[in-house]
């Protein structure tokens, strides 16, 4: 956030940039949390825009019995590996076809025993406040589907009648990692020393990191004709003086008519 300065007072302004603001020859360049000619004002909303999508990664192991292991399978640029990868990916795309969050598989390692396939199942969902539940449900369905296919697609009389056959006992889920996104924590961190006064409110399932000085939210402070300003002790209303009135009170709701004061009478609205 920047405020441009013109004229003789500019040199003076340069030395007075506050809150870590830096002078660029024309104006104070303010850090994220501040704005104003001297970076003296605290912003009332901070962009903590969530990522568009949240990902999860499941580390799985399955044992493929319909392919003979060779040392070439360890070499990811070999024809053996490339063909195995193509078929394994095709097979897994079929297995997980009913899971909207499913993105694909990534083979990390192939080892002996027929072919033990260490791989990641990649999941992704659009960000909503319920993303954890959505991804938790998806990981459960992945477990169910891989358990089912490795139980059903097995060699019978040394014949595999499917794209791939598996060893039922070789299926394991090692680890599940979900990208963490905590808007409340992000909001607190980005608000730094004002963290106690910034809160997260949702609109259309999108989180907004706001202070009570941001209008239009349930926590918004009504300063009436005054101006809401954030300080280290919290949000405060700075009351205005008009041609006819002085305003005071915590929310600038008390108006005193100047003419009455000059006439030694007080009148409150």
């Amino acid at each position: 956030r920047t405020t441009t300065c013109f004229g003789d007072g500019c040199q003076n302004t340069a030395s007075r940039c506050k809150n870590g603001g830096t002078w660029d020859g024309l104006k104070c360049q303010c850090p994220n949390l501040y704005y104003g000619e001297l970076c003296e004002e605290v912003v009332s909303s901070i962009d903590i825009g969530p990522p568009e999508t949240i990902s999860a990664q499941m580390e799985l192991t399955v044992t493929v019995t319909s392919v003979k292991f060779t040392e070439e399978l360890k070499n990811h640029s070999s024809q053996e590996f490339q063909e195995f990868k193509q078929t394994f990916t095709e097979q897994m795309n079929i297995v997980y076809s009913g899971i909207p969050e499913y993105v694909g598989v990534n083979i990390t390692k192939l080892r002996l025993g027929s072919v033990v396939v260490e791989h990641d199942v990649l999941l992704r969902t659009k960000y909503t406040p319920e993303y954890k539940t959505v991804l938790d449900n998806a990981t459960e369905v992945v477990k169910e589907k891989i358990t089912k296919v490795t139980t059903q697609q097995i060699m019978i009389n040394d014949i595999c009648s499917d794209m791939m056959c598996f060893n039922t006992t070789g299926t394991q889920v090692q680890n599940i990692t979900v990208t963490q996104y905590d808007p409340e924590e992000d909001c607190r961190k980005m608000a730094k020393e004002y963290g106690d006064y910034f809160v997260v409110e949702y609109r259309d399932q999108k989180p907004y990191c706001i202070s009570p000085c941001e209008p239009g939210f349930s926590v918004s402070k009504n300063c009436n004709l005054g101006k809401c300003q954030m300080s280290l002790s919290g949000p405060q209303c700075l009351c205005v003086t008009t041609e006819t009135h002085w305003y005071s009170g915590e929310t600038c709701n008390q108006g005193t008519q100047k003419s009455l004061v000059y006439g030694h009478h007080h009148h409150h609205h």
Partner: nanobody
């Protein structure tokens, strides 16, 4: 990448024989090989399959009439078709599995490489 080219198709009378060949551009030694066919307006079906060690499998409709064989030295696959019937009319294509595939038979999903096919028409 394995390229497969079929030959030997043509017009033949019912009860006669035909031999199809499939030439592979690469080594087929460690691959299951198979023949498929697709009749006009119908789905593709597996006809016959052969494992790298010569174990064969056939669709019920061709058992006793068709014989699949391979010559690894020549990187070739064959299908000997005897006692041909009108219902054998189809586009015949050969296919190769991924390397080191075991437990093969004639089903289509075991194969990742397929040829363009050769047309067999059985008609009097």
């Amino acid at each position: 990448e394995v390229q497969l080219v079929e030959s030997g198709g043509g017009l033949v009378q019912p009860g006669r024989s035909l031999r199809l060949s499939c030439a592979a551009s690469g080594d087929i030694t460690r691959r299951c090989m198979g023949w498929f066919r697709q009749a006009p307006g119908k789905e593709r079906e597996g006809v016959a399959g052969i494992s790298e060690d010569g174990i064969t499998g056939y669709a019920d409709s061709v058992k006793g009439r068709f014989t699949i064989s391979r010559d690894n030295a020549k990187n070739s696959l064959y299908l000997q078709m005897n006692s041909l019937r009108a219902e054998d009319t189809a586009l015949y294509s050969c296919a190769a599995s991924i390397l080191n595939r075991v437990g093969c038979r004639q089903l289509s999903y075991e194969y990742i490489y397929r040829g363009q096919g050769t047309m067999v028409t059985v008609s009097s």
